[in-house]
């Protein structure tokens, strides 16, 4: 008699998550009498997927009526496929007995599940970094299958090259994760910049997923400080200006010191934004020269975003120099960020 054959025609079947998978199996002979069972995997740890005779398999149905006389088609349909269903499925013929004896197995059908990657999540550095420093951004996406995936990084539309990407696990799995790190050199112009992580996968039909991060959350642009004397007024008041420019974020505290003593402290708030996203702030201090016998050392002290304070100092000379009265040109820069302003005493 002809030897019984169990035929699984497809070596592999690929199905999108959520869809149904049909696993085909036919036998070449009605004899010997005995059931067909479907298993995932082989050996003692294999998992029973479908047994027509007994058991409850809510997601599995027979494609054709297995109770029909002369039925030789034992194909099954598994509904609502998830990545956890991936594996090799075997159609196995048993000879009727007590217990039934395994007689012949099909060659197996490998079921792979196409699953979309999750929306990429981009995270930046935990602390801000100043311009001209390099910071790392990470992008993660999970749960996709098959393993082949493309991830690209962009900064303001330009692709980044300093990128390291890993897909895990290395071996075969029901689903995969991708993690990529991009190193970005910050510039003072990056407050409005954005990095984009773009993930392309066969399940996305050419419409990649994107995750974004704003460099405004990663960057600190330290201020420029300039202290100038605006004028010498007739009432012997010197108007000194501290200009704090091109800083980000807005969090800033300015303190005026007269001869080392705090004169006034101000907090920046509700400042207008420059085109590049940075801020400017100007603070004035009126110094009554006639109230001072000795030279006055003025210091504009700026503490930006919790960083160490930056100082700019001036010396207002309280001495009789009538011809220089009202002058704002006689300032000379010392090596210690100080300026000497010579004010006449009238």
């Amino acid at each position: 008699e002809e030897e019984l054959q169990v035929i699984q025609p497809e070596k592999s079947v690929s199905v999108a998550a959520g869809d149904s998978a049909t696993l085909n199996c036919t036998v070449s002979s009605l004899i010997p009498v005995g059931p067909i069972q479907w298993f995932r995997g082989a050996g003692p740890g294999r998992e029973l997927i479908y047994n027509l005779k007994e058991g409850h398999f809510p997601r599995v149905t027979a494609v054709s009526d297995p109770t029909k006389r002369n039925n030789m088609d034992f194909s099954i349909r598994i509904s609502n496929i998830t990545p956890a269903d991936a594996g090799t499925y075997y159609c196995v013929k048993f000879r009727k007995g007590s217990p039934d004896v395994e007689l012949k197995s099909g060659a197996g059908t490998e079921l792979s599940v196409r699953a979309k990657p999750s929306a990429p999540v981009v995270s930046g550095p935990a602390v801000r970094a100043t311009a001209e420093h390099t910071v790392s951004f990470t992008c993660e996406s999970h749960g996709f299958s098959p393993r082949d995936i493309t991830l690209k990084w962009f900064k303001n539309g330009n692709e980044l090259s300093d990128v390291q990407t890993n897909v895990d696990p290395a071996g075969k799995s029901v689903s995969y994760s991708i993690r990529s790190t991009a190193r970005v050199l910050l510039t003072r112009r990056d407050v409005h910049s954005q990095v984009i992580c773009e993930v392309a996968h066969v399940t996305l039909q050419g419409d990649p997923l994107r995750g974004t991060a704003n460099l405004s959350e990663a960057i600190r642009v330290p201020p420029f400080l300039e202290v100038t004397q605006q004028s010498m007024r007739a009432d012997n008041q010197v108007n000194v200006t501290c200009q704090v420019t091109k800083f980000y974020p807005q969090r800033l505290q300015l303190t005026w010191l007269e001869n080392g003593n705090v004169s006034r402290t101000e907090m920046a708030s509700a400042l207008p934004e420059n085109k590049d996203g940075t801020y400017n702030w100007t603070s004035w201090l009126l110094v009554n020269v006639s109230a001072h016998r000795d030279d006055v050392k003025l210091t504009c002290q700026v503490e930006h975003d919790g960083q160490p304070a930056v100082n700019k100092s001036f010396s207002v000379k309280v001495s009789a120099h009538p011809k220089e009265q009202g002058s704002n040109t006689a300032a000379e820069n010392t090596g210690t960020n100080e300026r000497n302003i010579y004010g006449g005493s009238g």
Epitope: F39, R40, G41, A42, G43, P44, G45, R46, E47, G87, T88, Y90, V92, R95, V101, E102, L103, K104, S105, G106, G108, P169, G171, K172, S173
Partner: antibody, heavy 122, light 112 residues
């Protein structure tokens, strides 16, 4: 080609727990059984148990109450934990891959790690 | 548990000569699918075991054809047609019919 690498402490105190990890490189965990086998000094081989890719475990009854084998597919690793060790558990511990085919079953432990020596001593 | 018994315990051999190792199981390793669930392994000195023969008579990949496995049911034999120096080590049989998998006590093959 597939390679297996055992890792874990070489010395364990009596009554403590022995923990070993086997890292699978160059291949997949799927469709195989993953074994732990040990060999006491100057003696023969003893099968401790194995785990299938679906997480199903099989243990040697002589050790069952003390042994746990687990699988981490994301790391391509499987692990052995054995509680309440004694000097009799001093051995070279091998991790190994067992092939399996439907209609055949187990057909050969075809890949072995190089083995790691574990000494149980105070 | 299935008990595996190997003989001889030690086998001195002459290079170029044949050698034979016996393995007996306490119950039949022949399953209804006509396969004998017996494997042979060689453990060279200081090395891990390596698979030589699986399912009674199938040579593993890369194993020289001077190695052959035979037998059925409870009696099995590993033959080396012409022993070479690299064949020294301890040979183990193992049953894979049911868990727990069990090994024979080993046969030490050494050059005379």
């Amino acid at each position: 080609q597939v390679q297996l690498q055992e890792s874990g402490p070489g010395l364990v105190r009596p009554s403590e727990t022995l923990s070993l990890t086997c890292t699978v490189s160059g291949g997949s965990i799927r469709n195989y059984y993953w074994s732990w086998i040990r060999q006491p000094p100057g003696k023969g081989l003893e099968w401790m148990g194995f785990i299938y890719d679906n997480g199903r475990t099989f243990y040697n009854p002589s050790l069952k109450s003390r042994v746990t084998i687990s699988l981490d597919m994301s790391m391509n690793q499987f692990s052995l934990k054995m509680t309440s060790v004694t000097a009799a558990d001093t051995a070279v511990y091998y991790c190994a891959r067992v092939r399996a085919y439907s209609g055949i079953g187990l057909d050969g432990t075809d890949v072995w790690g190089q083995g790691t020596t574990v000494t149980v001593s105070s | 548990d299935i008990v595996m018994t190997q003989s001889p315990l030690s086998l001195p051999v002459t290079p170029g000569e044949p050698a034979s190792i016996s393995c007996k199981s306490s119950q039949s390793l022949l399953y209804s699918n006509a396969y004998n669930y017996l494997d042979w392994y060689l453990q060279r000195p200081g090395q891990s075991p390596q698979l030589l023969i699986y399912l009674g008579s199938n040579r593993a990949s890369g194993v020289p054809d001077r190695f052959s496995g035979s037998g059925s049911g409870t009696d099995f034999t590993l033959k080396i047609s012409r022993v070479e120096a690299e064949d020294v080590g301890v040979y183990y049989c193992m049953q894979a019919l049911q868990t727990p998998l069990t090994f024979g006590g080993g046969t030490k093959v050494e050059i005379k």
